[in-house]
Amino acid sequence: MKVLQEPTCVSDYMSISTCEWKMGGPTNCSAELRLLYQLVFQSSETHTCVPENNGGVGCVCHLLMDDVVSMDNYTLDLWAGQQLLWKGSFKPSEHVKPRAPGNLTVHTNVSDTVLLTWSNPYPPDNYLYNDLTYAVNIWNENDLADSRIHNVTYLKPTLRIPASTLKSGISYRARVRAWAQHYNTTWSEWSPSTKWYNSYREPFEQR
């Protein structure tokens, strides 16, 4: 049994780090492999993650953490029974992928404006809470070329756009993702999309 692509891990900087790797051939990850992880700190336990399959040769494991601070470092050991396949380490603060924003809602009852709101995926006591900026993707359901990205660089999880910038009588979808500038993170996954119908019509004298 051989590791083809070594584990790479990303942390949500809250309670979960996700590690993925590829094996040299088809593998029943949960039956054959175990990823052991231990915080490098006095008297910390060695926990065991039972991986799950991620494609034919891919495996994924979720490492559970109570909290994350910048100096945390974990040792990782990938075992197949009593055989050590790979040994490595992981510093969560250096490989952050934020959680996806949630509760994306579209408010169209404000005249001439489409208001999008969403929730910050972190509690206020988390370091990332005040460091997130967002990208909002809006697209026309019937014409994928009619798509745009709005960068939200302020802290408030809201975006206002004039309804007149969207085609009338068309269904649109929106989704949002986040990143944290000061932690040099990757982008989060996109939030689930939400749909609305743009019923805005230009005033008669502007037609």
Partner: antibody, heavy 128, light 109 residues
Framework: EVQLVESGGGRVQPGGSLRLSCAAS?????????MCWVRQAPGKGLEWIGC????????TYYASWAKGRFTISKASSTTVYLQMNSLRAEDTATYYC????????????????????WGQGTQVTVSS | DIQMTQSPSSLSASVGDRVTITCQAS??????LAWYQQKPGKAPKLLIY???TLAYGVPSRFSGSGSGTDFTLTISSLQPEDFATYYC???????????FGQGTKVEIK
């Protein structure tokens, strides 16, 4: 210094109740773990009672014999309790608090496995 | 619940002896087995976890082996401070339960 300190032991009448506490100190706040209770009757072996996950999920596991009369709860990730009800003479023992590693599959299936660090124990005597 | 059968229940040995204690699980527990040492009036001390991994600060004369249902603790050369009671702890994947063996008391011959 890393340590676990139990308190709340003492003498109680049969049928009575008692709540034991365990306070942990010296650990990294980052380290997820279970907090568990194990007991040992005089001159007997070790007997696992149950565990509670110290993180936000707070899931609990109990030995089959302990379900119903024994309840483990937590005030925080560093303070846990063992509530014992309808106590009997055979519950007389030293009660230890222990910190445990876990096995997880995904983020919702987590179970405790070995006890890495133990408190000094607190004595409970059930007698009339 | 699983059952852990530990043997022998007691043994007499001399300093320098090689000592072996076995533990058998009633079902397959992979490598989820730990060994503890307990001295009178003291809390147990972790020696080995994951069947064969030595806990931090434990002397290398202690070793563990086995997987599945059969496990062994070996003390390669018994020292005066090793006279104590030893317990195995098996953890069941299916039920989340943790069961101790009955204990093995190692006494001076």
């Amino acid at each position: 210094e890393v340590q676990l300190v139990e308190s709340g032991g003492g003498r109680v009448q049969p049928g009575g109740s008692l709540r034991l506490s365990c306070a942990a100190s010296g650990f990294s706040s980052s380290s997820a773990h279970y907090m568990c209770w194990v007991r040992q009757a005089p001159g007997k072996g070790l007997e696992w009672i149950g565990c509670i996950y110290a993180g936000s999920r707070g899931s609990t596991y109990y030995a089959s014999w302990a379900k119903g009369r024994f309840t483990i709860s937590k005030a925080s990730s560093t303070t846990v309790y063992l509530q014992m009800n309808s106590l009997r003479a055979e519950d007389t023992a030293t009660y230890y608090c222990a910190r445990a590693a876990f096995v997880n599959r995904g983020v919702s299936w987590i179970w405790p496995y070995y006890f890495s660090l133990w408190g000094q124990g607190t004595q409970v005597t059930v007698s009339s | 619940d699983i059952q852990m059968t530990q043997s022998p229940s007691s043994l007499s040995a001399s300093v320098g002896d090689r000592v072996t204690i076995t533990c058998q699980a009633s079902e397959d527990i992979e490598s989820y087995l730990a060994w503890y040492q307990q001295k009178p009036g003291k809390a147990p001390k972790l020696l080995i976890y994951r069947a064969s991994t030595l806990a931090y600060g434990v002397p290398s004369r202690f070793s563990g082996s086995g997987s599945g249902t059969d496990f062994t603790l070996t003390i390669s050369s018994l020292q005066p401070e090793d006279f104590a009671t030893y317990y195995c702890l098996g953890s069941s994947y299916s039920t989340g339960s943790n069961i101790f063996g009955q204990g093995t008391k190692v006494e001076i011959k």
